[in-house]
C-alpha cells in the first residue's frame, strides 16, 4: 500500500522588530517534531508596517492600534486558524525606544502599554513587548546568521548553501546597522575580552562560544546624520550649512528644534541665532568622510585597542555578515558584490556623491526623495564606520559579506530572539535519530 502523508505538523512564531525608523513583522515556521534541529526554522513572511517607528507615536499614541492592524491581519491570513492560539508573538523594540526611554521612562512605558494592549486583541499567544538591550540585539543577530548558515550544525556539508559559505564550523561575525544604533559581534581569536560588558558566553549545540559584542547607541545611520548636522551647524557662519554629504544642488530646511530633539545631539547643543537652517549640498565624498570621522573619538582608549569612544574592540577575526542598513544601502548603491574591493567602493562613492541632485532624481525617479537624498551620507558613513570605526582594512574588506537574506530568511536579530524565547537552541547537541517516522503512515 502507498504511504499517505499526514497533515503537515508545523509550528509558527511571530516577531515584530520595532526599530527606530519602522516596524517589521516576521513570521517563522518549523516542523514541530524537529524543534531542536539546527536550521529548520525559516521565514515565511515579512510585513513592513506603514509609518515610522513606534517611538514617533509619543504624541499620537491613539494611532498605534491602527498602525499595527495591516500586518497583524496579514499574520492572521498566513497562519492557519487552527494554529493561532499556539502561535507566540513577541515584540522587541530597539534603539529608537532606548532613546525615548532615556528621555522619559514614563513616555516609553506609555507607548509600550498601548502596543501591548493593541497586540493582545489578536488571537495569538502574545508574549509581550519589551525594549531589548543593545547587547541582546548584537547577540541575537549573531545567532541568526550563524543558525541560518548552518554553523551550529555538527555535520559538515560537502556542498555550500550560500555563495560565501565556508565549509568549516568557524562562525561568522555580525555587523548590524540600524537607524539609531549599530552592533558588532564576533568570536575573537584566542583573545581575552578586556571589558566584561562586551563579553558573552554561550553553549549552543554542545559547543562553547566566547563572543564579543557592542552596540553603539546614536551611531545608527539616522542618528549619526543628526549628530553630524548638529556638529557642523556649530561652526556655520549663518543659517546656511554647506554640506559635502549631500548632492550638489540639493537643498533642505531643517528645524533646530528637530535637530536637538534627540539625546544623540545633546553633546553638540548650543544656542543658535536662528530657528531654522538650510542644508545646501556640495557633494564631496572626501570632505563628507572627514566630517563623519569627527563623530568618532579615537584619542582615548583604556584598553589594548578600541573601536572609538573608548570602547574595547578585539582584533577582527574571520568572516562577517553585514546586514540591515549595511545591506540596504550598499544594495541600492550596487556595491554588495563580493568582487568589489574597498578601493572600488570608495571610488564609486566619490562619483555618486558628486552627481548633481537633479540628475540623481531623474536616475532614481521611483525612490522617495527623503531616502534618495541620504544615500551619499549613508554610504560614506558605512565606509567610515567599517574602516575607521571598526578597523577593517582594504585587505580584510573582502571578509565582509553584505547579506540581505540567508536561505529566504532575513538576516537580523528577530530569528535569534525567537529561537531563544521558544527554547529552540539547545545547549547540548540533540541525539540524532536516523529517521523520523512521524510523517508517514
Amino acid at each position: 500500500t502507498q504511504n499517505k502523508a499526514l497533515p503537515e505538523n508545523v509550528k509558527y512564531g511571530i516577531v515584530l522588530d520595532a526599530g527606530s525608523s519602522h516596524t517589521s513583522l516576521y513570521i517563522y515556521k518549523w516542523p514541530a517534531e524537529k524543534e531542536n534541529d539546527t536550521g529548520v526554522v525559516h521565514q515565511v513572511e515579512e510585513c513592513r508596517v506603514k509609518g515610522p517607528g513606534i517611538s514617533k507615536f509619543v504624541q499620537k499614541v491613539n494611532e498605534i492600534g491602527i498602525y499595527l492592524t495591516d500586518c497583524m491581519e496579514r499574520a492572521r491570513e498566513v497562519i492557519p486558524r487552527s494554529q493561532h492560539q499556539e502561535t507566540p508573538v513577541y515584540l522587541g523594540a530597539t534603539a529608537g525606544m532606548r532613546l525615548l526611554r532615556m528621555e522619559s521612562e514614563e513616555l516609553a512605558d506609555r507607548v509600550l502599554d498601548v502596543v501591548e494592549r493593541s497586540l493582545s486583541n489578536y488571537p495569538f499567544d502574545f508574549q509581550g513587548a519589551r525594549i531589548i538591550t543593545g547587547q541582546e540585539e548584537g547577540a541575537y543577530g549573531w545567532i541568526t546568521i550563524n543558525y541560518l548558515l548552518g554553523k551550529f550544525s555538527q555535520k559538515t556539508r560537502w556542498f555550500s548553501i550560500v555563495p560565501y559559505e565556508t565549509n568549516n564550523q568557524e562562525t561568522f561575525g555580525a555587523l548590524d546597522l540600524g537607524g539609531a544604533s549599530t552592533q558588532v559581534t564576533f568570536v575573537p581569536q584566542n583573545q581575552t575580552i578586556e571589558s566584561p560588558d562586551n563579553a558573552l558566553q554561550f553553549r549552543l549545540y554542545g559547543k562553547d562560544y566566547n563572543v564579543y559584542t557592542h552596540s553603539f547607541l546614536c551611531y545608527g545611520k539616522d542618528q549619526a546624520l543628526w549628530q553630524k548636522l548638529a556638529k557642523d551647524i556649530q561652526v556655520a557662519s549663518n543659517e546656511i550649512l554647506r554640506d559635502p554629504c549631500f548632492h550638489p544642488g540639493y537643498k533642505k530646511v531643517v528645524n533646530v528644534s528637530d535637530l536637538y530633539k534627540t539625546p544623540c545631539t545633546k553633546r553638540f547643543e548650543m544656542t543658535l541665532p536662528f530657528q531654522q537652517f538650510e542644508i545646501q549640498g556640495i557633494g564631496n565624498y572626501q570632505q563628507c568622510h572627514q566630517s563623519i570621522l569627527e563623530l568618532f573619538n579615537t584619542s582615548y582608549c583604556p584598553y589594548s585597542q578600541c573601536a572609538f569612544n573608548g570602547i574595547f574592540l578585539p582584533p577582527l577575526q574571520g568572516d562577517f555578515g553585514a546586514f540591515s542598513a549595511f545591506y540596504f544601502v550598499m544594495k541600492f548603491l550596487n556595491l554588495t558584490s563580493e568582487k568589489v574591493s574597498q578601493e572600488k567602493v570608495t571610488e564609486m562613492m566619490k562619483k555618486f556623491c558628486a552627481q548633481p541632485w537633479e540628475e540623481i532624481k531623474t536616475s532614481y525617479a521611483g525612490v522617495k526623495e527623503k531616502y534618495l537624498s541620504e544615500y551619499c551620507f549613508s554610504g560614506t558613513y558605512i565606509l567610515s564606520l567599517l574602516l575607521q570605526g571598526y578597523h577593517f582594512t582594504a585587505d580584510s574588506w573582502e571578509h565582509i559579506h553584505f547579506i540581505g537574506k540567508i536561505q529566504g530568511s532575513d538576516a537580523g536579530w528577530t530569528l535569534g530572539y525567537m529561537l531563544n524565547l521558544t527554547n529552540m537552541i539547545p545547549a547540548e547537541q540533540p541525539l540524532s535519530t536516523p529517521l523520523s517516522h512521524s510523517t508517514y503512515v
Epitope: 499614541v61 491613539n62 498605534i64 492600534g65 514614563e106 512605558d109 506609555r110 509600550l112 502599554d113 498601548v114 501591548e116 494592549r117 493593541s118 493582545s120 502574545f126 508574549q127 509581550g128
Partner: antibody
Framework: QVQLVQSGAEVKKPGSSVKVSCKAS????????IGWVRQAPGQGLEWMGG????????NYAQKFQGRVTITADESTSTAYMELSSLRSEDTAVYYC????????????WGQGTMVTVSS | EIVLTQSPATLSLSPGERATLSCRAS??????LAWYQQKPGQAPRLLIY???NRATGIPARFSGSGSGTDFTLTISSLEPEDFAVYYC?????????FGGGTKVEIK
C-alpha cells in the same frame, strides 16, 4: 483621593445587552487605564477588558471578544462596559478598577454592579 | 494565557497564627504579581503589588515574596479582620489573570 462609582444593579433578559458605567472623581481620569473584572456568584475574579480613556485604546479577553465593548467619555470622566447577547452565565458582579501605569495592578475598585440575567 | 494556581484552596487558622498562601504561575511573570483581599459583599482591595510592595495603608503584617513563577503572601499574625478570600493576579502579560483564590477561615 480617586473614587470609582458604578451604576446600579440591572436585571436583563437572555439575548439582550447591558451597559454598566463607572464614573471617576477626585483625580486624573484620562491618563490611567480602567479595567473591567467580573465575579459570578461564589466564583473567582475574571478580567474582561480595559481601556485607556486618553487614547481610546481598548483591549479584551479573547473569551469576550465580539461580545463586549469598552468605551470612555473623557468629558464626564466615565468609562462604560457593554456586554451583548447575554446568557444566564453572565449573571455576576461587574467591577471597574483603575490600572494606573503599564503592568500595574488594579489599585482602586468601584463598588461593583450586580447584573442578573434571567428569563 | 498565564494560569495562576493558588494553594491551599482553604486555610483554617486561629487569630494570632501565621498564614502562608501560595501562588504558582504557568510561566514566568517576572515580579509583576499582586495580591488582593476580598470580604463578602465587598470589592477586592489591593494588598501587595510587584510581588513584595505593600499598597498604601496596608499593615506591616502583610508581606509578599517571590519572582518568576512562585510567589507567597504571608500574614505574620492573623487579626480577626484578616479572615477573607485572597486572590493573586499577574500583570505581566495580557490577558490579566487571577488565581482561583484562597479562603482564610477561622479554625
Amino acid at each position: 483621593q480617586v473614587q470609582l462609582v458604578q451604576s446600579g444593579a440591572e436585571v436583563k433578559k437572555p439575548g439582550s445587552s447591558v451597559k454598566v458605567s463607572c464614573k471617576a472623581s477626585g483625580g486624573t481620569f484620562s491618563s490611567n487605564a480602567i479595567g473591567w473584572v467580573r465575579q459570578a456568584p461564589g466564583q473567582g475574579l475574571e478580567w474582561m477588558g480595559g481601556i485607556i480613556p486618553a487614547f481610546g485604546t481598548a483591549n479584551y479577553a479573547q473569551k469576550f471578544q465580539g461580545r463586549v465593548t469598552i468605551t470612555a467619555d473623557e468629558s464626564t470622566s466615565t468609562a462604560y462596559m457593554e456586554l451583548s447577547s447575554l446568557r444566564s452565565e453572565d449573571t455576576a458582579v461587574y467591577y471597574c478598577a483603575r490600572d494606573p501605569v503599564r503592568r500595574s495592578p488594579f489599585d482602586i475598585w468601584g463598588q461593583g454592579t450586580m447584573v442578573t440575567v434571567s428569563s | 494565557e498565564i494560569v495562576l494556581t493558588q494553594s491551599p484552596a482553604t486555610l483554617s487558622l486561629s487569630p494570632g497564627e501565621r498564614a502562608t498562601l501560595s501562588c504558582r504561575a504557568s510561566q514566568s511573570v517576572s515580579s509583576y504579581l499582586a495580591w488582593y483581599q476580598q470580604k463578602p459583599g465587598q470589592a477586592p482591595r489591593l494588598l501587595i503589588y510587584d510581588s513584595s510592595n505593600r499598597a498604601t495603608g496596608i499593615p506591616a503584617r502583610f508581606s509578599g515574596s517571590g519572582s518568576g513563577t512562585d510567589f507567597t503572601l504571608t500574614i505574620s499574625s492573623l487579626e480577626p479582620e484578616d479572615f477573607a478570600v485572597y486572590y493573586c493576579q499577574q500583570s505581566f502579560l495580557w490577558p490579566r489573570t487571577f488565581g482561583g483564590g484562597t479562603k482564610v477561615e477561622i479554625k
